[in-house]
């Protein structure tokens, strides 16, 4: 079996963590978040070729069926395996509050 | 805000549970599984338009950035939110064994 972390499509082409710089406006948050003004958003981007970072048995099945029926079954998709928490300083009706979100920034990625 | 379960692309076009009939050969299991001979594989297929079954804050961010930078950031993707377990009767060196897999069949779907 191919090494599950070696990308057969070339360096950086397969499912991995990327960082995208975004403003509050980019995120659609300007009306309800005060800080941070800008976010380094970590997200999972890239192709999921066979056996690459397969999350589970379902991902294996999906890849096998995709090869058989590519028009019916899509290839596995690169999604977060876990997340890093982030605190936002939010506007409220009465002022501001701190809110921690556990599902905002991807920490690592896999194919499902 | 649009109803998170109403598909704006038309019935059945958005992220939802599909069933795909597959044989052991289709799944690549013929050499290590005895039963079942055929599987009704439930999997998540379909588009993830804005606000449709968004799994979490990360999915919202991803959609907003996808609209801004479609060549850099892909749209959210339709993946299992949970799984149904399934038991397989497996071949072993000495005969057969029962093995339950918790991550084989999708139970419901969301966009990440």
């Amino acid at each position: 079996a191919r090494n599950g972390d070696r990308c057969p499509l070339g360096p950086g082409r397969c499912c991995r963590l990327h960082t995208v710089h975004a403003s509050l406006e980019d995120l659609g948050w300007a009306d309800w978040v005060l800080s941070p003004r800008e976010v380094q958003v970590t997200m999972c981007i890239g192709a999921c070729p066979s056996q690459f970072r397969e999350a589970n048995m379902h991902a294996q099945i999906k890849m096998n069926l995709h090869r058989l029926k590519p028009d019916t079954v899509p290839a596995p998709c690169c999604v977060p395996a876990s997340y890093n928490p982030m605190v936002l300083i939010q506007k409220t009706d009465t002022g501001v509050s701190l809110q921690t979100y556990d599902d905002l920034l991807a920490k690592d990625c896999h194919c499902v | 805000a649009r109803n998170g379960d109403r598909c704006p692309l038309g019935p059945g076009r958005c992220c939802r549970l599909h069933t795909v009939h597959a044989s052991l050969e289709d799944l690549g299991w013929a050499d290590w599984v005895l039963s079942p001979r055929e599987v009704q594989v439930t999997m998540c297929i379909g588009a993830c338009p804005s606000q449709f079954r968004e799994a979490n804050m990360h999915a919202q961010i991803k959609m907003n950035l996808h609209r801004l930078k479609p060549d850099t950031v892909p749209a959210p993707c339709c993946v299992p939110a949970s799984y149904n377990p399934m038991v397989l009767i497996q071949k072993t060196d000495t005969g057969v064994s029962l093995q339950t897999y918790d991550d084989l069949l999708a139970k419901d779907c969301h966009c990440v």
Partner: antibody
Amino acid sequence: QVQLQESGPGLVKPSETLSLTCTFSGFSLSTSGMGVGWIRQPPGKGLEWLAHILWDDVKRYNPALKSRLTISKDSSKSQISLKLSSVTAADTAVYYCVQMAWDWFAYWGQGTTVTVSS
Amino acid sequence: DIQMTQSPSSLSASVGDRVTITCKASQNVDTNVAWYQQKPGQSPKALIYSASYRSSGVPSRFSGSGSGTDFTLTISSLQPEDFATYYCQQYHSYPTFGQGTRLEIK
């Protein structure tokens, strides 16, 4: 519920190094945007920011005191230490540990009094 | 560094009075200003963030305004528990505080 508890020696001799510890709970320093800082207040005077350490291990120091300050976090991530070297009587103050959310000093500890005297 | 100059340094007022404390930055700090309240023998408490947003649990009689270099903290109707020292702070560059305004009972 956020809690910060400062601990220190109480009395330090001139020219020695002051070591302070902040033990915190109710938040995680591995959360993006979180930080822990130190602010001091000499008797009867105003507030002076000393240093802070952020979730990503970035450290910031007051330029006027930078050469004398060292901030660090314990591997358990629930303790922050501050060292101030070559102390003089001017370093006598109440030292506060503060939770930072991004750039805001959101929650303050009760403070620990440090006197520099021989 | 950015200097924050508060005025007045102290003032006397009565319960029910409207009180305004001003803070002037030595250079433009946008709205990157916070206000804190400190009662005798206690640690400071966050009141206002981003010039005008009240911290959670702060009564509505406290309000902040301003941007650029000029900022104000207003207490619309003084209550007995409001007699304290108030500090402004900028976080546009490394943090600096005003010298404080002591609010006393007349």
